[in-house]
């Protein structure tokens, strides 16, 4: 399965929308900075077969979609940008699901993948814990928005490496 060019464009559009969603200066939130322990190792891509890599990406986008679909998120971000962002993520999820269906026939997904998906879930669990701890303050959401932008940028490099492998 070739990850379509539209998926790459979708990723770029999602990043642009995330950037546009910023409402307050990140400099005013420096005291709220937090290391969420992004599982970089899961996106190194060396130990991965294609179906594994795609399912880890899918998990990350799914978790991002869930995070920005909450009531607290709706109360924080500008509605039209949030809707566009959700639509973009939904399209990416559909692309990746179509790819996984094709790839699973080609190769068995090893159990190793279970670890990677759980690592991504824990990462988002830490983000949710942080937001709860900070009572979903504007600065906490700003820190999370910046973190998701960073993780999307890193996963974008991962996707490009995947495409080159093809």
């Amino acid at each position: 399965c070739d990850l379509p060019q539209t998926h790459s464009l979708g990723n770029r559009r999602a990043l642009i929308l995330l950037a546009q969603m910023g409402r307050i200066s990140p400099f005013s939130c420096l005291k709220d900075r937090h290391d969420f322990g992004f599982p970089q190792e899961e996106f190194d891509g060396n130990q991965f077969q294609k179906a594994q890599a795609i399912s880890v990406l899918h998990e990350m986008i799914q978790q991002t979609f869930n995070l920005f679909s909450t009531k607290d998120s709706s109360a924080t971000w500008e509605q039209s940008l949030l809707e566009k962002f959700s639509t973009e993520l939904n399209q990416q999820l559909n692309d990746l699901e179509a790819c996984v269906i094709q790839e699973v026939g080609v190769e068995e997904t090893p159990l190793m993948n279970v670890d990677s998906i759980l690592a991504v879930k824990k990462y988002f669990q830490r983000i949710t814990l942080y937001l709860t701890e900070k009572k979903y303050s504007p600065c906490a959401w700003e820190v999370v928005r910046a973190e998701i932008m960073r993780s999307f940028s890193l996963s974008k490099i991962f996707q490009e490496r995947l495409r080159r492998k093809e």
């Epitope: 900075r33 937090h34 290391d35 969420f36 322990g37 599982p39 190792e41 899961e42 130990q47 090893p110 159990l111 190793m112 993948n113 279970v114 670890d115 990677s116 759980l118 690592a119 824990k122 669990q125 830490r126 814990l129 942080y130 701890e133």
Partner: antibody, heavy 122, light 107 residues
């Protein structure tokens, strides 16, 4: 009875390599992440590396990244660490440790072996 | 990396005394702070996980409290067998980091 038994320690020259093994018994090895933690004689504890329950999700301390490699064989209930380019600062007791969850982070180190001593010296 | 600062580095107390060891982290680790005991010549043993959860088989005189960045291990009534080194560790993210340790001696 739950047990972790390390082996493979010994004297090695700077720049040399060593492979440590740890055999687990008394619990479902394939369900838990495993770590290596070291302790230089008379010093504190330093986490070295962790591997997820299925052999994925490998994490390393900055001090060993690129030199050490953690792996596991669930069919033989065995954890390994391959240590290359060893330096005198790697001299320590190496403990094999069971984690409380399937992958590292947001958990604890709930069972420790007796440790194996690695001495890096000329 | 998350820095973990433990104090004091050593203490001497009498049997029956109440003893407290403090642990601070450089950023919030929520409740993911663990405490270990290491007796001389032995491997460490988990006493308390997730800030306050006592492990099975650990005497009830040990207790843990705190969340975020500030944590405390308390031994309510010190016993001779409690002579050991105690370490706190953040299990929130990797690299896992430990406090420098506190050596507890019996007077």
């Amino acid at each position: 009875e739950m047990q972790l038994m390390e082996s493979g320690g010994g004297l090695v020259q700077p720049g040399g390599s060593l492979r440590l093994s740890c055999v687990a018994s008394g619990f479902t090895f394939k369900s838990f992440a495993m770590s290596w933690v070291r302790q230089a004689p008379g010093k504190g504890l330093e986490w070295v590396a962790s591997v997820g329950s299925q052999g994925g999700s490998k994490y390393y301390a900055p001090s060993v990244k690129g030199r050490f490699s953690i792996s596991r064989d669930n069919s033989n209930n065995t954890l390994y660490v391959q240590m290359n380019s060893l330096g005198v600062e790697d001299t320590a007791f190496y403990y094999c440790v069971k984690e409380t969850d399937a992958v590292a982070t947001m958990d604890a180190l709930d069972m420790w072996g007796q440790g194996t001593l690695v001495i890096v010296s000329t | 990396d998350i820095r973990v600062t433990q104090s004091p580095s050593s203490l001497s107390a009498s049997v029956g005394d109440r003893v407290s060891i403090s642990c601070q982290t450089s950023q919030s680790v929520n409740i993911y702070l663990n405490w270990y005991q290491q007796r001389p010549g032995k491997g460490p043993q988990l006493l308390i996980s997730a800030a306050s959860t006592l492990q099975s088989g650990v005497p009830s005189r040990f207790s843990g409290s705190g969340s975020g960045t500030d944590f405390i291990l308390t031994i309510i009534s010190l016993q001779p067998e409690d002579s050991a080194s105690y370490y706190c560790q953040q299990g929130y993210i990797t690299p896992y980091t430990f406090g420098q340790g506190t050596k507890v001696e019996i007077k």
